[in-house]
């Protein structure tokens, strides 16, 4: 997250970190069910661990943390690397979470976002770009949903209805390491960090997010079919 600020503790209990060995964060994710996460499809890896209820990026033990393995990864059937359409994936955890103030699911919004809606994006991704500098703790950033026309103007021929753009002033954006993390609007999960320009936070080049309102049926049916 570029030019965000430290999230208040316990305010993002659905935020997960996807980790490679040794404790290497590569993506964020979102708890949407006691045993299921949503993340970006481009975050698919064979072997990874899931950390929930953790505030700092470092692997130091925190009393609220819960660690899991991903036992099943189900990317949306319409996703095709290296494209960005349908960029979402469900991950089944090896067991159900223990609900606490630090670990709690969030509901996926069934309403599509309108331009001007104020949202919050969070993650442990780099805070500088193109340099790489990681934060000590989870970062939060207020962003506004942009109209689809502004989104298409920013990225000609690259935007479809499975995506929406959101940003703020130049210099504020999600970035590498934030993929799969939550965009929360009006208390519901509206999007996932997906892609954007490089370097991050360039003027008139907003972040692009997976438009989850288009996928509520797929999410529900996939969880039911695999539970």
């Amino acid at each position: 997250i570029i030019n965000g600020s430290d999230c208040d503790m316990h305010t993002q209990p659905w935020q997960a970190a996807l980790l490679l060995r040794p404790n290497q964060l590569y993506c964020g994710a979102v708890l949407v069910h006691p045993q299921w996460l949503l993340t970006a499809a481009h975050c698919r890896k064979k072997v990874f661990r899931v950390r929930l209820g953790h505030y700092s990026l470092s692997p130091v033990y925190e009393s609220g943390q819960q660690m899991f393995q991903g036992v099943k990864s189900i990317p949306h059937p319409g996703y095709s690397h290296p494209g960005h359409s349908n960029d979402l994936m469900l991950i089944k955890l090896n067991r159900r979470i223990r609900p606490t103030k630090d670990v709690r699911p969030i509901n996926v919004s069934s309403h599509c976002p309108s331009a001007g809606t104020k949202c919050l994006v969070s993650g442990w991704g780099t805070t500088k770009s193109p340099q790489v500098h990681f934060p000590k703790v989870l970062q939060c950033l207020n962003i506004s949903v942009l109209s689809q026309k502004r989104c298409e103007d920013a990225y000609p021929r690259q935007i479809d209805d499975t995506m929406f753009c959101a940003g703020d002033k130049a210099g504020r954006d999600s970035c590498q390491g934030d993929s799969g993390g939550p965009v929360v609007c009006n208390g519901s999960l509206q999007g996932l960090v997906s892609w954007g320009d490089y370097p991050c936070a360039r003027p008139n080049r907003p972040g692009v997010y997976t438009n989850l309102c288009k996928f509520t049926k797929w999410i529900q049916e996939t969880i039911q079919a695999n539970s």
């Epitope: 490679l20 290497q24 964060l25 590569y26 993506c27 970006a40 481009h42 975050c43 890896k45 290296p82 494209g83 960005h84 991704g125 780099t126 193109p130 790489v132 999600s174 970035c175 590498q176 390491g177 934030d178 993929s179 799969g180 960090v193 997906s194 892609w195 954007g196 320009d197 490089y198 370097p199 991050c200 360039r202 080049r205 972040g207």
Partner: antibody, heavy 126, light 107 residues
Framework: EVQLVESGGGLVQPGGSLRLSCAAS????????MNWVRQAPGKGLEWVSY????????DYADSVKGRFTISRDNAKNSLYLQMNSLRAEDTAVYYC???????????????????WGQGTTVTVSS | DIQMTQSPSSVSASVGDRVTITCRAS??????LAWYQQKPGKAPKLLIY???SLQSGVPSRFSGSGSGTDFTLTISSLQPEDFATYYC?????????FGGGTKVEIK
Amino acid sequence: EVQLVESGGGLVQPGGSLRLSCAASGFTFEHYSMNWVRQAPGKGLEWVSYISSSSSYIDYADSVKGRFTISRDNAKNSLYLQMNSLRAEDTAVYYCARDLTSMQSRDYYYYGMDVWGQGTTVTVSS
Amino acid sequence: DIQMTQSPSSVSASVGDRVTITCRASQGISSWLAWYQQKPGKAPKLLIYAASSLQSGVPSRFSGSGSGTDFTLTISSLQPEDFATYYCQQVPIFPYTFGGGTKVEIK
């Protein structure tokens, strides 16, 4: 078949210019960042330049900064390297290489260069 | 710039031998290291990315390990087609830099 084909190499005098081209086929060129890498006779690999998929980020090795310019034309599936003020030490085989890391995607994961051309030889000599 | 130091610069080995090549970065690069194989007159070929992930189509006798500053490429049982030069490369930080190469020769 995924393929990169370089062209434009040749013999040039010190101080001269050349423009290398790299034609891409078999993949969606506009989705990938690209690199130029060179190899002097009997030496190792040296990274020369990088360009992101949308051309929004470009970088160069210090040894070529200010003399070489990387560019791309996504509509033509082509990558270019304009080389000016050439020196004897620029003599090398020049490879274009696809970067498997998508810098547009916002995961923190880096791959490497997975597709390489056959190379084109640049000789700088009087 | 990050310096990548490979050792040894050359190694003589026989078919069936286990060969280990090391690469050291001048500063930590997490797991973001790639290994390439290059045969004379040919372009390099990506073998391993992210320090230990095998590129599609690469035989399983090749393996990589390491994190931070120290990395290893291992060929568990050398085959005739493995005689080549091997390079490591750090990929997270510009300028990208390669190691000096390790030539694997027939003993």
